[in-house]
């Protein structure tokens, strides 16, 4: 007997068939599934004998379904039975939450039954527009996944579906809008002094790895002043700042070297109570005096620092009551510059330094006696001393040889410098001063000077006369002439003088391109530290030019004739004589002749023919004027 | 002067593993983060990971979480990137990066190729 | 997107000025940095920060910055100036993002 067919669901796409039957009776079972209108085709499964229980996977969801199972003993089938049932509804999807957003991330969270799904399928859509949505699948184990690559402040609808191999569920979907992008947050400053500032800020925790804070006075083009903090301060203390002054304070967060935008917040300090006008004047010559001026009741005490400029030493400290505005700061060198420093103290704060420099008074004193622009008969005398002390110096010049009497000058405190004058030349002096001021005479300090030979200048020579110039040599003191001065004046005076200046060393000039036969003046004085000696004199005249004269013809021959003329001896170093027929017919005849040459013996002239002749002679390159002559050959 | 030189690069199977290398010279190893940065070809510049100059801190790109691992050694002076479970869209020339403070990447190696194919 | 946005291309005649440009919503708190690559070549930084060059960068190679772009200026530019340039910034997960790049012809 086959009987107690019960038909169950499995899931949503399965049945489950039990039934009962004899043990050992049936070779097989034969199992129709049809859906219960018929639309499809049935299914049919046999299944083995011993079976008494089957599922039936792969159905429709929500679908009535018609089983019918028959039995076949030894070829037999038994009565068919048949049962209807339908399977589940679909399983849907949970719920879809946004677990953690982000500007430009979210985590999203679903919840499904566990196995029902291969993968979903989540669709990230921006809310009203029409750009295309992202599209991610993720295994069908999961229930959350990270969505990134969002833009900041946007609303997105985010729909998912459950899917298996032929089967996709309702979507879920869920709205959500992603956060701004982050700020730092707030920068605000909660306490200000006149020499720091509390900078606090807000941002989120873990964001940053370090910040930057930039603290520049407002205004100014210096480098600011930088400051790095790790990035789990929120607060932070910018000391060493100035009084009374606008700052611009900016932060920055960092990761991995990016840095944000900055925030920014500008704040003054506070003032301080005025420490201000210190003056430092000299009280005598080992203290000094310092005034300052302060707000009344401000300052608990004041440090006065006073230290020499040009040592590190120890400075000398002191501390004193802040009612006061004045000290006297005694036991210091004289003539010392000294660094005074002030600042004062208002509830354990420092105020700013003030400093000042200044010198004590030197002791009177006299120095550097210097002696300078010697002459023949004068000095001049140079030295240092305090100002404002002495009255009246005393100055004494006495001859090293003690030939002659001392002599002595009081002059004014004012004066630093004296006028020697009437003193013999060549002459050694020693030169005493000392500077005299109500009960004081200070130390004699002295100097040596020696007066200058008068100088010479002596012995105008002219020398190597010529027609064209002469040399004019002089003698003079050695070393005592800057420069001299030769002027060279026409004795006719027609001509403009010629001057020539000559260094101090020179003894001799040489004159050229002078006109001959004329007299000439010369005169030559020295220079010494600009002032101009008396000239010495000269008259000369230069030679006249040397002359060729009577050229004479003699001894006419058909071919030539004789020439013979008259020259100053020892003036040219030699002659020239030109020869040419008077009407040209032939090429003219040119003779270069030695100095001592007077007569010459011309031949291979063409006879009964007129010549003309011209001879002049060369000195030094210079053509004497020329003469000339007219001769005639004889006939043949 | 500063110096980075990758190595471990070359060919290698889908699902296989390599481990890049980067010798760091010429700064303080131990005080700067460093990053890998890699390049497909004829693509642009895609950033990998990151790590802390001490080591402690650890970034990745979404393409690699899970599959690839960054670490330093900084006794060594050098930088590792470890890829486990390769593909193909993973081929690509990679650098590593020093990044200082306030001055992101401010020196790259040359580039080492890894490519990813049967 | 946080992705950085650039143009692809860009062309410039020699000696005149060009702007390469970035989008994207983390440059709202960051600033961008800049990175030239010459072909079979490493990136160089060019620009970072506010607009802070490194050492060796010529000064015609500018940053500036405003509400979600960023933007490289070369003023004058020369031939050596052609190359591919990225923007790079930091994204919310403190990751490093990178722009496409812009492939800048000089002509």
């Known amino acids: 007997e086959l009987e107690n067919l019960t038909v169950t669901e499995v899931g949503w796409d399965g049945l489950r068939l039990n039934w009962t039957a004899a043990d050992q009776a049936y070779e097989h079972f034969i199992i129709q599934v049809q859906e219960a209108n018929k639309v499809e085709a049935a299914r049919n499964l046999t299944v083995p004998g011993s079976l008494r229980a089957v599922d039936i996977p792969g159905l429709k969801a929500a679908t009535p379904y018609t089983v019918s199972i028959y039995g076949v003993i030894q070829g037999y089938r038994t009565p068919v039975l048949s049962a209807e049932a339908s399977t589940g509804e679909t399983p849907n999807l949970g719920e879809v939450v946004v677990a953690e957003v982000g500007w430009d991330a979210l985590k999203l969270n679903w919840t499904a039954p566990e196995g029902a799904y291969e993968y979903f399928f989540i669709q990230v859509q921006e809310a009203d527009t029409v750009e295309a949505a992202q599209n991610l699948t993720v295994p069908g184990g999961l229930r959350s996944t990270d969505l990134p690559g969002l833009k900041a402040a946007t609303h997105y609808t985010i729909t998912i579906r459950g899917v298996t191999q032929d089967f996709s569920t309702t979507p879920l979907s869920v709205e959500v809008l992603t956060e701004e992008v982050p700020d730092m947050g707030n920068l605000t400053v909660t306490e200000v002094s006149w020499d720091a500032l509390r900078l606090n800020w807000t941002t989120p925790d873990g964001t940053y790895d370090q910040f930057t804070i930039q603290v520049q006075e407002a205004d100014q083009v210096e480098e600011a002043h930088n400051l790095t903090v790790p990035g789990s301060l929120r607060s932070m203390e910018i000391p060493g700042l100035r009084a009374g002054t606008p700052y611009t304070v900016t932060l920055h967060g960092e990761v991995r070297g990016h840095s944000t935008r900055p925030l920014a917040v500008e704040v003054v300090t506070e003032d301080l109570p005025q420490l201000g006008d210190l003056a430092v004047s000299e009280v005598g010559w080992d203290g000094l005096r310092l005034n300052w001026t302060a707000a009344d009741n401000a300052y608990e005490h004041f440090v006065i620092q006073v230290q020499e400029v040009n040592k590190v030493e120890a400075a000398q400290n002191l501390t004193l009551p802040g009612s006061l505005r004045a000290v006297d700061i005694p036991g210091l060198e004289a003539a010392t510059p000294y660094r005074v420093s002030i600042y004062g103290v208002i509830r354990g704060y420092r105020t700013p330094v003030l400093s000042a420099e200044a010198s004590t008074a030197k002791e009177p004193e006299i120095g550097n006696l210097n002696v300078s622009d010697i002459t023949p008969e004068s000095f001049n005398l140079s030295w240092m001393a305090t100002d404002g002390i002495f009255e009246t110096f005393t100055i004494e010049i006495i001859d090293s040889n003690r030939l002659l009497e001392t002599v002595e000058y009081n002059i004014s405190g004012a004066e630093r410098t004296a006028h020697i004058s009437g003193l013999p030349p060549s002459t050694d002096f020693i030169v005493y001063l000392s500077g005299l001021a109500p009960s004081i005479r200070t130390k004699t300090i002295s100097a040596t000077a020696t007066t200058e030979a008068l100088p010479l200048l002596e012995n105008l020579t002219i020398s190597d006369i010529n027609p064209y110039g002469f040399t004019v040599s002089w003698m003079a003191s050695e070393n005592a002439f800057d420069s001299f001065l030769v002027t060279v004046v026409d004795s006719g005076k027609l001509l403009d003088p010629q001057e020539f200046t000559l260094s101090g060393t020179q003894r001799k000039l040489e004159l050229r391109g002078l006109i001959t036969g004329i007299g000439y003046e010369v005169m030559v004085s020295g220079f010494t530290q600009g002032h101009q000696t008396k000239p010495l004199r000269a008259e000369i005249v230069t030679e006249a030019e040397p002359e060729v004269d009577n050229l004479l013809v003699s001894d006419a021959t058909p071919d030539g004739f004789r020439l013979s003329w008259t020259a100053d001896e020892g003036v040219f170093d030699n002659f020239v004589l030109k020869i040419r027929d008077t009407k040209k017919q032939s090429e003219p005849l040119e003779i270069t002749l030695l100095a001592p040459e007077r007569t010459r013996d011309i031949t291979g002239l063409r006879e009964a023919t007129e010549y003309e002749i011209e001879l002049y002679g060369i000195s030094k390159g210079r053509r004497s004027q020329t003469v000339s002559a007219i001769a005639t050959t004889a006939m043949g | 002067e500063v110096q980075l030189l990758e190595s471990g690069g070359g060919l290698v199977q889908p699902g296989g593993s390599l481990r890049l290398s980067c010798a760091a010279s010429g700064f303080t190893f131990s005080s700067y983060a460093m990053s890998w940065v890699r390049q497909a070809p004829g693509k642009g510049l895609e950033w990998v990971s990151a790590?802390?100059?001490?080591?402690?801190?650890?970034y990745y790109a979404d393409s690699v979480k899970g599959r690839f691992t960054i670490s330093k050694d900084n006794s060594k002076n050098t930088l590792y990137l470890q890829m486990n479970s390769l593909r193909a869209e993973d081929t690509a020339v990679y650098y590593c990066?020093?990044?200082?403070?306030?001055?992101?990447?401010?020196?790259w190696g040359q580039g080492t190729l890894v490519t990813v194919s049967s | 997107s946080s992705e950085l946005t650039q143009d692809p291309a860009v062309s410039v005649a020699l000696g005149q000025t060009v702007r390469v440009t970035c989008q994207g919503d983390s440059l709202r708190s960051y600033y961008a940095s800049w990175y030239q690559q010459k072909p079979g070549q490493a990136p160089v930084l060019v620009i970072y920060?506010?607009?802070n060059r490194p050492s060796g960068i010529p000064d015609r190679f500018s940053g500036s910055s405003s509400g979600n772009t960023a933007s490289l200026t070369i003023t004058g530019a020369q031939a050596e100036d052609e190359a591919d340039y990225y923007c790079?910034?930091?994204?919310?997960?403190?990751?490093?993002?990178f722009g496409g790049g812009t492939k800048l012809t000089v002509l």
């Open positions: 990066a020093k990044t200082s403070p306030r001055v992101p990447l401010d020196y």
């Open positions: 790079n910034s930091i994204n919310s997960t403190r990751n490093e993002v």
């Open positions: 920060g506010k607009n």
């Open positions: 790590i802390s100059g001490s080591g402690g801190s650890t």
